[in-house]
């Protein structure tokens, strides 16, 4: 194998791998025909002048996970065929100017997970064929203008997990071929207008986990090919009305963990490929008409953990494909009867941890495919007659932690619940809050005549699906359920329809049952 160092393994196809803590310098002699060299997990601390001089055919060089902290400017001399160079996971703080000079074929340069403090235009000025540059996980505080000006063929640039506080609007201006730009986990507070204007081929932009407060109105207007836009966990307080108008290819958009207070109608411009929109952990207080009307293919809308107290009746217009709507942990007190009318394909709605006092009888009128409804931990005292009657696919209904008023008016609901107990789950059942003498007792088994002995309970029709089931033997037997089979058979049809089984979020938030419902 043309002389393989003892501490390395060499294959007859010119592959050399040198690993182990006993290696403290680049092993020699390296086989002259080596095309791939990997130096991994060693105790090498520096690269001196031209350690690879005799292996000019080298195509790939990986020097990773070492103690490397110093490199001589001529370390990579004579490696004109090198296409891939990784110096990731070392302890580099400084890159000497001219280090990459002569690497005319270099396409991938990985400098991630080091301790680099700065980069300069001269560092990459010779790397005109570079397609991928990984700089994430360093200590960069700023990028000087011109740093990437010669990298016109660059398609992927990762600057994530650094300490960048600002970005010059000119720093990316020559990167017309860039497809992926990652700036996540920095300290950016704003992005100047025009910063991304030259990135006409950009498909992924990762800006999550910064401190961005404002987005310029036209920030993404030249990025028509953008498909993934990550903006979560910033300090964004408002979205300019046109900021997302020119993003027809977008299929992933994250905005959770910001400070958004309001959303203007049509803010989400036509995005026919967007399936999920996560807006949880913001400060949204109301939803106006048509705010999501352009999102025709949206299937999941997460609006939980906001401060929503008002939803306009037409807020969800256009969401004909929506299957899951999460509104839990907000400040809702009332809902318009037509608010969900357009959501014909809705299967799961989360309304727990709000302040709902009542629900309109037609609230679920057009949402016939509902499988799961979360209503726990609200202020509900009763529910309208027949509210769930048409929901033949309903297999999960959570009603606990509400102040149910167990007077005679509760009978229709109680009877329906009695027949549909499996839908309520086994963890927690709804209990009476009033009158005081039945407080804490299960709503399902409570004897209403005990609760309110002075009130005569008239024989009224109940939820049409189920017969009225009185407590006292003075009522005719014909109104009682004839057999347990009749009681359970409709329910058995639903127990297998657990297409969506929403997990209880209490564990995620570390809340007790009393806190969260």
């Amino acid at each position: 194998y043309h002389g393989c160092p003892s501490e390395c393994t060499c294959s007859r196809a010119s592959q050399v791998e040198c690993t182990g803590a006993r290696i403290v310098a680049v092993p020699t002699p390296l086989p002259w025909n080596a095309m791939s060299l990997q130096i991994l997990n060693t105790h090498i601390t520096e690269l001196n002048e031209s350690p690879f001089l005799n292996i000019s055919a080298l195509i790939a060089l990986r020097i990773e996970k070492n103690e490397l902290s110093r490199i001589t400017p001529g370390a990579f001399r004579n490696l004109g065929s090198l296409r891939y160079l990784s110096l990731a996971n070392n302890k580099l703080q400084v890159l000497p100017i001219g280090l990459f000079q002569g690497l005319d074929s270099l396409e991938s340069l990985l400098l991630s997970s080091n301790q680099l403090l700065q980069i300069q235009p001269a560092h990459f000025s010779q790397c005109s064929n570079l397609k991928e540059l990984q700089l994430h996980g360093n200590h960069l505080e700023y990028i000087p203008d011109g740093a990437f000006d010669h990298l016109v063929g660059l398609t992927k640039l990762n600057l994530g997990k650094n300490s960048l506080t600002h970005i010059s609007p000119r720093v990316f201006q020559h990167l017309g071929n860039l497809q992926v730009l990652r700036l996540y986990e920095n300290r950016l507070t704003d992005i100047p207008m025009g910063t991304f204007d030259g990135l006409v081929n950009l498909q992924e932009l990762a800006l999550q986990q910064n401190q961005i407060g404002l987005l310029s109105p036209g920030l993404f207007h030249n990025n028509h090919n953008l498909q993934r836009l990550y903006l979560s966990n910033n300090h964004i307080s408002q979205l300019p009305p046109s900021v997302f108008m020119q993003l027809p290819q977008l299929n992933r958009l994250t905005l959770f963990g910001n400070s958004l207070k309001e959303l203007s109608p049509g803010i989400f411009g036509p995005m026919p490929n967007l399936r999920e929109l996560w807006l949880y952990d913001n400060h949204i207080s109301s939803l106006p008409d048509n705010v999501f009307s352009n999102l025709r293919q949206l299937q999941v809308l997460i609006l939980s953990r906001n401060q929503i107290s008002f939803i306009s009746p037409g807020a969800f217009n256009g969401l004909t494909e929506l299957r899951e709507l999460s509104l839990h942990t907000n400040a809702l007190q009332d809902l318009d009867g037509n608010v969900f009318r357009m959501l014909a394909n809705l299967q799961n709605i989360s309304l727990q941890n709000n302040r709902l006092r009542q629900l309109p009888g037609n609230i679920f009128a057009n949402v016939n495919g509902l499988m799961a409804i979360q209503l726990q931990n609200n202020q509900l005292e009763n529910l309208p007659l027949g509210i769930f009657d048409h929901l033949g696919k309903l297999c999960e209904l959570r009603l606990y932690d509400n102040p149910w008023r167990c007077d005679s008016d509760i009978l229709p609901l109680r009877n329906w619940l009695l027949l549909n107990q499996p839908r309520l789950g086994t963890d927690t059942v709804p209990v009476c809050f009033s009158p005081a003498n039945v407080r804490g007792q299960s709503l399902i088994i409570i004897n209403v005549n005990v609760a309110v002995p002075s009130v005569h309970v008239p024989e009224v029709p109940s939820y049409p699906e189920t017969p009225w089931y009185p407590d006292t033997p003075s009522y005719p037997d014909t109104t009682s359920v004839s057999s347990t089979t009749e009681l359970t058979s409709p329910v058995e049809d639903y127990t297998d329809l657990t297409t969506i089984q929403v997990t209880d979020d209490r564990s995620v938030w570390g809340m007790t049952q009393a806190q969260s419902g």
Partner: antibody, heavy 122, light 107 residues
């Protein structure tokens, strides 16, 4: 350890129905997208469907749209594929896989089951 | 839908050889591409994600490169356990299509 186990594969006649199950263990099932992929005998891999972590979002390949339904039960750590109007060309090994993705560029089916054979023949 | 083509469809190589497999997308998919290895009778195994990132536990002899429409999987030194079929897959948009596969067998 992290594991996916498919079941439910069988011999079925054209036009028939079948329900495949995939039992997950060793990871927090409700945190992950899940997917079904199939492989006809001697052929390549074909993505057929995936489902979001909560079950809200779903997508299908055109070849199965309207005939197959993907679903999940997070309480039971289970993924399902309800197949109806089966055709001879649906004959394949069906794999379930965990679809792992994040906002730092990770995208991949990183955990696979062993597969279950579905044969559609008269 | 995005169509992935792989070349070659099959190749014969010896232990120690350097092997290169190409995957081309019908339209740009940035770096949303993964590579899998499948052995007969077994489920596929993820090797590379994000076009060039090595999945945890995968030997460092595997590497990926490329973005946009042209991608490459390289096995720096073929080992006996590397004889298998290799598939690329795109995650840029639905449906998440696979390439037709490249079979690597013993010369």
């Amino acid at each position: 350890q992290v594991q996916l186990v498919e079941s439910g594969g069988d011999l079925v006649t054209p036009g028939g129905s079948l329900r495949l199950s995939c039992a997950a263990s060793g990871f927090t099932f409700s945190d992950y997208y899940m997917t079904w992929i199939r492989q006809a005998p001697g052929k390549g891999l074909e993505w057929i469907s995936d489902i979001g972590s909560s079950g809200g979002s779903v997508d299908y390949a055109d070849s199965v749209k309207g005939r197959f339904t993907i679903s999940r039960d997070n309480a039971k750590n289970s993924l399902y594929l309800q197949m109806s109007s089966l055709r001879a060309e649906d004959t394949a090994v069906y794999y379930c896989a965990r679809y792992n993705w994040n906002d730092r560029g990770y995208d991949g089916f990183d955990i696979w089951g062993q597969g279950t054979m579905v044969t559609v023949s008269s | 839908e995005i169509v992935l083509t792989q070349s070659p469809s099959s190749l014969s190589a010896s232990v120690g050889d350097r092997v290169t497999i190409k995957c081309r997308a019908s339209q740009g998919i940035s770096s949303a591409l993964a590579w899998y290895q499948q052995k007969p009778g077994k489920a596929p195994k993820l090797l590379i994600y994000d076009a060039s990132s090595l999945e945890s536990g995968v030997p460092s002899g595997f590497s990926g490169s490329g973005s946009g429409t042209d991608f490459t999987l390289t096995i720096s030194s073929l080992q006996p356990e590397d004889f298998a079929t290799y598939y690329c897959q795109q995650f840029n948009s639905y449906p998440h299509t696979f390439g037709p596969g490249t079979k690597v067998d013993i010369k």
